[in-house]
Structure formats: C-alpha cells, structure tokens
C-alpha cells in the first residue's frame, strides 16, 4: 500500500530536496526559504531566484520552507508556572521549561505545568526527579507512600491500601500490648 | 458517545458554596485529565481547574485559587467541583471538560453546563 500524500507533498516529492513545485506552473522548481525567512514570491523561473524575506520580530521559522507567513512565537504560560529558558529568535520558537527543583507535568501533547520535586521527607530518593518526572519516594518504615508523600502509619486507615504497607508496625504494637499483659 | 453531564449549579448567596458534579460515559474515564471551565455572561471561556486521572497534580486558575477544590471518583466515572466563598464574578456557566492527549487544544469534549448565579 503507498501511503497517502497530501497536495502539498505530492507536489514537494516531484522536485529534488530543497526546492519545490511552482504552484502556478508545474515545470519549475523554486529554491526553498531558508530558516529564519519565508516565501515572499515564487521563484519567476527555471534556475532564478525565490523571493524570501526575513521574519519579523515576534515571529520565526524553524526549517527551510515555503509558508506565505511566518509562525507566531509561542508564550511561556505564566500561569502554569512556565518559565522562559529561550527567547523566539527568527529561526527558532521560545523555548519554554520548570525553574530548578521542578518536574513538567503535561496536561496534553502541548501543554504543561510545572511542579515542585517531592522532598521524600520520613523516606529516601529511589529516583531522582526528572524533566518530566517526579522523585520516586521509598519511605522509612512505620511510613506509607500517599500522593507521592511519606505519611505516618498513624494516619492508615483500615480500608486504605496502607494496611498492607502498615501491616507489620500494626502486628508490632499489638505483640507489645500482648506481651505487657502476661 | 462521549457524554458529560453536569449538575448542581443554581443559586446562592455571596461568601456561599456549591458543589457541581459531572457524570462521564462514553469513554474510559480511568484514562483521561479532566477539568472545569467557565463562562460569565458576555465574556470568554476561562478555564478553573484540571485534575489528573490519580489526582496528584491539579491546576486552578489565580482567580479560584484557594477557593475552589477539584477532586475525582474514579469508582464512579464522576467529576466534582467544591465552590466555597463564592463572589459574584464567579457567576458564570460551569462546563465539564475532557482533556485531550493530543494537540494544543486543551479540551476535546465538553457538557451542556450548569449555570452558577451568584447575587444577594
């Protein structure tokens, strides 16, 4: 099965890589924009020249192309704790990330939120935090593991799944109160 | 069919609260972020909180911050949003969302909503 091609890549794949088709005249390859530029007007002819212009402040392109526009610079989300690690130049986008000791927690394919790396406080670090992921916690024992936090095995109620985990401190304290009653 | 339905709203009192609800069907609710957004009347959507599917990681918009609570029951395919010290610039419609795992928009799927009147 030939996989299906969109026009504009049907249209790339006639020309050798670099260049692409004239969309008013399917006999003449146009040298492709460079990065940082755009199509301002096809090329007039075979071997001549395509008019590309630099993209304006605001605005970038990240590869060589043949777009009419350049693409916008997207904005680090304040709001999401976003912070800006590199401005939008013409040939590259912001570049967007966590502060220190932060960990992106992606709500979609294109957007995250930045969160602070568990401490593992009453435990230990089993993996350190990630770009993209939070510290593993390996808790100290009389402890359990609760929304990635090291809570006290007081605090296990009999229909959590601590019970498991508080178990053996469970049987300990009982095994004291037995022996203390002989 | 994915199906949100929400409910709950009405109204209530400044400094008052509420708490909506959202039944989820048609899709696997054990997989999926999900969230609330608002509407106040003659202005655009905002969005008020996101949750993930364990509940580990929410997000509240500055303006509910503090005052609004998110939480999820998986067992029952239902979303909730605790709304507690409610103002008037709060009065909106409260629309369920389902996020989506691709692209840049953050919502695939949204309910009917619930209208939410704040006023004395």
């Known amino acids: 099965l030939v996989p299906h091609l969109g026009d504009r890549e049907k249209r790339d794949s006639v020309c050798p890589q670099g260049k692409y088709i004239h969309p008013q005249n399917n006999s003449i390859c146009c040298t492709k924009c460079h990065k940082g530029t755009y199509l301002y007007n096809d090329c007039p002819g075979p071997g001549q020249d395509t008019d590309c212009r630099e993209c304006e402040s605001g605005s970038f392109t990240a590869s060589e192309n043949h777009l009419r526009h350049c693409l916008s610079c997207s904005k680090c989300r304040k709001e999401m704790g976003q912070v800006e690690i590199s401005s939008c130049t013409v040939d590259r986008d912001t570049v967007c990330g966590c502060r220190k000791n932060q960990y992106r927690h992606y709500w979609s394919e294109n957007l995250f939120q930045c969160f602070n790396c568990s401490l593992c406080l009453n435990g230990t670090v089993h993996l350190s935090c990630q770009e993209k992921q939070n510290t593993v916690c390996t808790c100290h024992a009389g402890f359990f593991l609760r929304e990635n936090e090291c809570v006290s095995c007081s605090n296990c109620k009999k229909s959590l799944e601590c019970t498991k985990l508080c178990l053996p401190q469970i049987e300990n304290v009982k095994g004291t109160e037995d022996s203390g009653t002989t | 069919e994915v199906q949100l339905l929400e409910s709950g709203g009405g109204l209530v009192q400044p400094g008052g609260s509420l708490r909506l609800s959202c039944a989820a069907s048609?899709?696997?609710?054990?997989?999926?972020?999900m969230g609330w957004v608002r509407q106040a009347p003659g202005k655009g959507l905002e969005w008020v909180s996101m949750?993930?599917?364990?509940?580990?990681?929410?997000y509240y918009a500055d303006s509910v911050k503090g005052r609004f609570t998110i939480s999820r029951d998986n067992s029952k395919n239902t979303l909730y949003l605790q709304m507690n010290s409610l103002r008037a610039e709060d009065t909106a419609v409260y629309y369920c969302?389902?996020?989506?795992?691709?692209?840049?928009?953050?919502?695939?799927?949204w309910g009917q909503g619930t209208l939410v009147t704040v006023s004395s």
């Open positions: 969302a389902k996020i989506s795992q691709f692209g840049s928009n953050a919502f695939d799927y």
């Open positions: 048609g899709f696997t609710f054990t997989r999926y972020s």
């Open positions: 949750i993930d599917v364990p509940g580990l990681h929410t």
